[in-house]
Every structure is written in structure tokens, then in C-alpha cells.
């Protein structure tokens, strides 16, 4: 699986999850998030050679098409597969609130 | 929606579904498919500027990150959203077989 366990431990050029730390205030302009100050959102990148973690029949077909037609511009792309939520603390005035934001952290990637 | 209705009628540089005809024999080397000889598999391509058909909170956050950090290499990618099956005819010996292959045709795209 092209997940953090594999990708963060290997120098993988092809599609894999990459570490990306986002600071809420500096990178997004979100002053309203109190904790955490930032988080590892991660992202997916790298080429998708034929059959690498193909998501659907279409991505498999497209990968094969690319292999046999190297000049083609159509190819699968490395995108998030599994995402996890992030729990944040913010304040409504003086009152602390805890919220779970869905689909905030990429844990694995796929070729789609 | 970044679907064939919109994308095939507009000269859209950003993420959109593009027409791609695949000939089973010539492009995939699949001699076993009798009919059709080929089909429009289509594919997704084009940049994903901030908020263009963002798929998840993560892709929205990543898009915002990119907007505020233009030098960043992490950005959402244009990939299939809705896929449709394709019905094919092939032969097992002299016996014709009809099969519906799932997820063969891209009908719309998203930034993921």
C-alpha cells in the first residue's frame, strides 16, 4: 500500500504520500484555530506507471495505453486514497470548542 | 460540473474531462474484444486552481495552501469522478459472451 508506513520510509519516486506540514495561521490565514498550531496534511505525488496501485479499470486501461503509447499525454494521477480526520480546538469568544474536521490528513495514495 | 456536457463544449484549460478514443487492438493489444473495436475512455487533465471542484476538505485546504504559497509543489490533481461501464462482446471459442466492464468511461472529473 502507498501509505505513510511505506512511503515515509522509502525514497520512492513513483506515486506515494509525501509529508506536508501546514501551519494554520501562516499557511492558511486561519487565526481561529487555537490548537494544534498546524498539522501534517501530507499530499500525493509521483508518476503513475502501469498498474501502480490502480484505482479503477479505467486507470489500469489508461496506464496500459500510456505504456503502449509513450507519447500520449493521458495518464493516471497520484491522489489521496485514505484520509483521516483532525481534531482541533478553537474558541467561540472565551468558550473552548473541540471539533473533528473530516478528511484533513492523507494517509495513503492511489493512481486514479 | 466538470462533465462531458460542459468540458467537450468549452475550451477549458483547467481540470476537465477530455475525449480519448482507445482502439482495443491497436492501443491496448487486446485482440480478444470483438465489439466494439474501440471506445471513448476519456481522461482528466488540467490544472486544479484553488477550489476548482474540490473533492474533500483536504483538497480545498491544499488548494488554499497553494494559493498562499505559490512556490509549493503540493497541489490537487485532476482525476475521474464519475465513471460508467462499457458493454463488450467477446468470444469463448465460438460462443459469444456479453460482459459489462465497470468503470471504463470517464464522464466527469474532480480535483483531488
Amino acid at each position: 500500500a502507498l501509505d505513510t508506513n511505506y512511503c515515509f520510509r522509502n525514497l520512492e519516486e513513483n506515486c506515494c504520500v509525501r509529508p506536508l506540514y501546514i501551519d494554520f495561521r501562516q499557511d492558511l490565514g486561519w487565526k481561529w484555530v487555537h490548537e494544534p498550531k498546524g498539522y501534517y496534511a501530507n499530499f500525493c505525488s509521483g508518476p503513475c506507471p502501469y498498474l501502480r496501485s490502480a484505482d479503477t479499470t479505467h486507470s489500469t486501461v489508461l496506464g496500459l495505453y500510456n505504456t503502449l503509447n509513450p507519447e500520449a499525454s493521458a495518464s493516471p494521477c497520484c491522489v489521496p486514497q485514505d484520509l483521516e480526520p483532525l481534531t482541533i480546538l478553537y474558541y467561540v469568544g472565551r468558550t473552548p470548542k473541540v471539533e473533528q474536521l473530516s478528511n484533513m490528513v492523507v494517509k495513503s495514495c492511489k493512481c486514479s | 460540473a466538470l462533465d462531458t456536457n460542459y468540458c467537450f463544449r468549452n475550451l477549458e484549460e483547467n481540470c476537465c474531462v477530455r475525449p480519448l478514443y482507445i482502439d482495443f487492438r491497436q492501443d491496448l493489444g487486446w485482440k480478444w474484444v470483438h465489439e466494439p473495436k474501440g471506445y471513448y475512455a476519456n481522461f482528466c487533465s488540467g490544472p486544479c486552481p484553488y477550489l476548482r471542484s474540490a473533492d474533500t476538505t483536504h483538497s480545498t485546504v491544499l488548494g488554499l495552501y497553494n494559493t498562499l504559497n505559490p512556490e509549493a509543489s503540493a497541489s490537487p490533481c485532476c482525476v475521474p469522478q464519475d465513471l460508467e461501464p462499457l458493454t463488450i462482446l467477446y468470444y469463448v471459442g465460438r460462443t459469444p459472451k456479453v460482459e459489462q466492464l465497470s468503470n471504463m468511461v470517464v464522464k466527469s472529473c474532480k480535483c483531488s
Partner: antibody
Framework: DVQLVESGGDLVKPGGSLRLTCVAS????????MHWVRQAPGKGLQWVAY????????YYADSVKGRFTISIDNSKNTLYLQMNSLKTEDTATYYC?????????????WGQGTLVTVSS | ETVLTQSPGTLSLSPGERATLSCRAS???????LAWYQQKPGQAPRLLIY???SRAPGVPARFSGSGSGTDFTLTISSLEPEDFAVYYC?????????FGQGTKLEIK
């Protein structure tokens, strides 16, 4: 230059519906919490609702809860207020405003306002 | 909900005079959850002071804010003709946000 422009105000009968729009420009829209504040003719200011962009966390004043819906289209830099089951006491000029950054905060930019009149 | 009471309701002064506007909260707001706005007829409110004492960008130095807990003050050191308007205080310590009923500053 930061600009907020409201539209959609109209004369509507009690029980009717209306959707207000606020288009933002001149800043990164998704970075600031957005509010609706209203002002009845000749009266003071009353907070209506807020929404946090992207994560869509929203909150309402008790007087409009269940009748009004605040929403946001991040891609269009647009804030909305869908108002249903309108009452005569909802008659007011409605302003959209952005906060300095926190959820509850001072509001540094306001739109010009749009007038909603609820009357039979 | 936190009730804000402004006084006086109307303040009649001449240009060049000092104006002192008061805002009292029904419960303590701490030291940094109060803002002041100026509103002229037919216009939207304009932020003057936030955090009880910080001037918003572009606001003249003659405007100052002070106070903490339940008692807050907006002071205009020397009134200019364009300062005559309605002034509102706003608290954002607790939900819902509330505003005072306003003080009308008029030319004497």
C-alpha cells in the same frame, strides 16, 4: 481593497422566503470567519449568524434558529443567508461582515447592507 | 446573553470638545473582548476600536478606548465635524455577540 457587496433584499410577505448574497473581493475569502448582522429601521445592531469557511461550522442567534441558514460558496467568494418563514420582526437592513480572524471577534469590514421588508 | 448598556443615550457637544462615551456589560468581559463602531446615517458601521483599546487601521489618534471587566470607555479627545454619528459597543467574549443600543453624538 477589501469589498463586501450584499444583494437580494426585497419586500416579502410574512411566511415567505428570501436569499441574501454577499460577494467578497480583495482578500483571501476562506481565511476569515463571516457574519450576518441586521439593523431594524431606527434601531441598533443585532447579530444573526456566522460561518467558518471551508469547514462549514455555523451558528445562529436564537431568534432565527431553524428558519435561517448561513452558507458559503468558497469557489465564488460568496456568503449566503437563506431566510425562510419570515416574520415582520425580521424587517431590517442586513449586513455581511468579516471578523479580524477569530470566530467571535471585532468586524473590520462590512458590506453596504441590503434591506429586507417583511409586510403583508 | 451579555447585555451592553451605553450611556448617555445622546451626547450634545461642540467641535473641539472632548467626548466620553460609556459602555457597561452585564457580566465581566475580561480585558480584550470589546469593540467600538461608528455609524453614520445610511452607512454601514465602521470599526474604530477592538480589544477594548487597539485602534483599527486608518482610525485617527483622537479616538481611544479603555476599560476592562464590565466598564469600558470610548474617548474622542477633540471632536471634528465628521465625528458626529452614532457609536455602538460590541462584546465578543460570549455567544451570542451583542451590541449596545448606541450613543448618538450630536452637534450642540
Amino acid at each position: 481593497d477589501v469589498q463586501l457587496v450584499e444583494s437580494g433584499g426585497d419586500l416579502v410577505k410574512p411566511g415567505g422566503s428570501l436569499r441574501l448574497t454577499c460577494v467578497a473581493s480583495g482578500y483571501t475569502f476562506s481565511s476569515n470567519v463571516m457574519h450576518w448582522v441586521r439593523q431594524a429601521p431606527g434601531k441598533g445592531l443585532q447579530w444573526v449568524a456566522y460561518v467558518i469557511p471551508i469547514v462549514d461550522i455555523a451558528y445562529y442567534a436564537d431568534s432565527v434558529k431553524g428558519r435561517f441558514t448561513i452558507s458559503i460558496d468558497n469557489s465564488k467568494n460568496t456568503l449566503y443567508l437563506q431566510m425562510n418563514s419570515l416574520k415582520t420582526e425580521d424587517t431590517a437592513t442586513y449586513y455581511c461582515a468579516r471578523t479580524l480572524g477569530l470566530v467571535l471577534d471585532a468586524m473590520d469590514y462590512w458590506g453596504q447592507g441590503t434591506l429586507v421588508t417583511v409586510s403583508s | 446573553e451579555t447585555v451592553l448598556t451605553q450611556s448617555p443615550g445622546t451626547l450634545s457637544l461642540s467641535p473641539g470638545e472632548r467626548a466620553t462615551l460609556s459602555c457597561r456589560a452585564s457580566q465581566s468581559l475580561g480585558s480584550s473582548y470589546l469593540a467600538w463602531y461608528q455609524q453614520k446615517p445610511g452607512q454601514a458601521p465602521r470599526l474604530l476600536i477592538y480589544g477594548a483599546s487597539s485602534r483599527a487601521p486608518g482610525v485617527p489618534a483622537r479616538f481611544s478606548g479603555s476599560g476592562s471587566g464590565t466598564d469600558f470607555t470610548l474617548t474622542i479627545s477633540s471632536l471634528e465635524p465628521e465625528d458626529f454619528a452614532v457609536y455602538y459597543c460590541q462584546q465578543y467574549a460570549d455567544s451570542p455577540i451583542t451590541f449596545g443600543q448606541g450613543t448618538k453624538l450630536e452637534i450642540k
